[in-house]
């Protein structure tokens, strides 16, 4: 689904956050300065990511503040590395029928997940919610990101003189308008109706439509309800 990708959509303004979402909570994938990867209930400077599309649906995910690439070892553990290894630091991106995104290692086949278990990706599978991601536009002021992005430390490294070659730290004009949020709701649970148990809407946080051609009305992706 190359055209349904957050990588190509112009609405995300350079920096995005990948997050898992259940009916009640969400965790944002963050890459810490020491390379540790985990989830946070909110956007943090370490969950601000740059996702670059490569050939055949492959992506490279970068933690802007940690200046580390998201990588995976042979056991399926994800970690942040200053060095780009094409075998470990490229992921296959796929959009599931439910509109959520999964990322898996073409080398080791494991899914990127915020859960501790390591599961291989199989076509047609329904991964657990902590292995399915949505994307949100960055809401943290750009002044907090006054740091160079990582460069590939390989033989074909990019020009060291360019601190921000992709202009991810500079706001970009959007080529096409995108709705601020989607109004589609997930089916309400019979015993936990979102309207009944969440009258103030604290779990129905709006999210940016970062994927063109989504599954819901007006191209909206799944509407995640979380606090």
């Amino acid at each position: 689904y190359p055209n349904a990708s957050p990588l190509l959509g112009s609405s995300w303004g350079g920096l995005i956050h990948l997050y898992t979402a259940t009916a009640r909570n969400s965790y944002h994938l963050q890459i810490h300065k020491n390379g540790h990867v985990d989830g946070a209930p909110h956007q943090t400077i370490y969950s601000a990511l740059m996702i670059r599309s490569e050939d055949a649906g492959f992506v490279v995910i970068t933690g802007v503040m940690s200046r580390r690439y998201l990588c995976m070892d042979f056991r399926g553990n994800i970690f942040g590395s200053h060095y780009f290894d094409p075998e470990n630091c490229r992921f296959q991106h796929q959009t599931l029928e439910n509109g959520y995104d999964v990322y898996h290692s073409p080398q080791y086949h494991f899914l990127v997940s915020l859960g501790r278990a390591k599961r291989a990706f199989l076509p047609g599978m329904n991964p657990p919610p902590y292995s399915q991601f949505l994307s949100r536009r960055n809401e943290i002021p750009l002044i907090h990101f006054n740091t160079p992005i990582p460069r590939r430390h390989t033989r074909s490294a990019e020009d060291d003189s360019e601190r921000d070659p992709l202009n991810v730290l500079k706001p970009r004009a959007r080529m096409t308008p995108a709705p601020a949020s989607c109004s589609q709701e997930l089916p309400s649970a019979e015993d936990n109706s979102p309207m009944a148990s969440d009258p103030l809407g604290v779990v129905r946080g709006g999210r940016v439509n970062t994927h063109a051609g989504g599954t819901g009305p007006e191209g909206c992706r799944p509407f995640a309800k979380f606090i």
């Epitope: 898992t20 259940t22 009916a23 009640r24 909570n25 965790y27 985990d38 989830g39 946070a40 209930p41 909110h42 915020l114 859960g115 501790r116 278990a117 599961r119 329904n126 991964p127 657990p128 919610p129 902590y130 649970a189 936990n192 604290v202 779990v203 606090i227």
Partner: antibody, heavy 117, light 106 residues
């Protein structure tokens, strides 16, 4: 090491309110949601609600809507659960539990709340 | 909401027995299932997460399996300290618990 320490047992009269605290230590408080679960005597576990430690936003099971209030104090890494309009069937042990994305990995020791006239 | 049912609701077994507890979800929950052990007067203890992953520090005689709607917790050789109540919990949408299975001494 991670610890969740809850306040002591309470005895309340029907119609009153009770506020139970849960003090977290040994981890970054704002990095994990916190849940409240209760267990009536001889019964199973019942999920009550969840609180986002950074924003304070909450979401409750429909059964408790309007009666339960969850709050947090980030300065002391403490979450609170207040249950109002108590009735005898609210007699239970109340637990706080830390969310680890894929499980509740740490639990408080529990707080017994007895509602009796 | 997704409902969880456990069977049996209670069972009597002897030390050394192989014990199997099942948990069924009312709809598919992938592998987002957790098992806890609870002893009287104590808080629940995490045993298995993601349906089949053993939590650190939990003895290897405990194992979990299943995906979708049907899940199993197995204790390969019951030990004296394993007499307790076991709960499943789904993590797919809300945080529903199963009703529990009490394992007592035959």
């Amino acid at each position: 090491q991670v610890q969740l320490v809850q306040s002591g047992a309470e005895v309340k009269k029907p119609g009153a309110s009770v506020k139970v605290s849960c003090k977290a230590s040994g981890y970054t408080f704002t990095n994990h949601y916190m849940h409240w679960v209760r267990q009536a005597p001889g019964q199973g576990l019942e999920w009550m609600g969840i609180i986002n430690p950074i924003s304070g936003s909450t979401s409750n099971a429909q059964k408790f809507q309007g009666r339960v209030t969850m709050t947090r104090d980030t300065s002391t890494s403490t979450v609170y659960m207040e249950l109002s309009s108590l009735r005898s069937e609210d007699t239970a042990v109340y637990y706080c539990a830390r969310d680890r994305v894929d499980a509740f990995d740490f639990w408080g020791q529990g707080t017994m709340v007895t509602v009796s006239s | 909401a997704i409902q969880l049912t456990q069977s049996p609701s209670s069972l009597s077994a002897s030390v050394g027995d192989r014990v199997t507890i099942t948990c069924r979800a009312s709809q598919g929950i992938s592998s987002a299932l957790v098992w806890y052990q609870q002893k009287p007067g104590k808080a629940p203890k995490l045993l298995i997460y993601d349906a089949s992953s053993l939590e650190s520090g939990v003895p290897s005689r405990f194992s979990g399996s299943g995906s979708g709607t049907d899940f199993t917790l197995t204790i390969s050789s019951l030990q004296p300290e394993d007499f307790a109540t076991y709960y499943c919990q789904q993590f797919n949408d809300y945080f529903t618990f199963g009703p529990g299975t009490k394992v007592d001494i035959k």
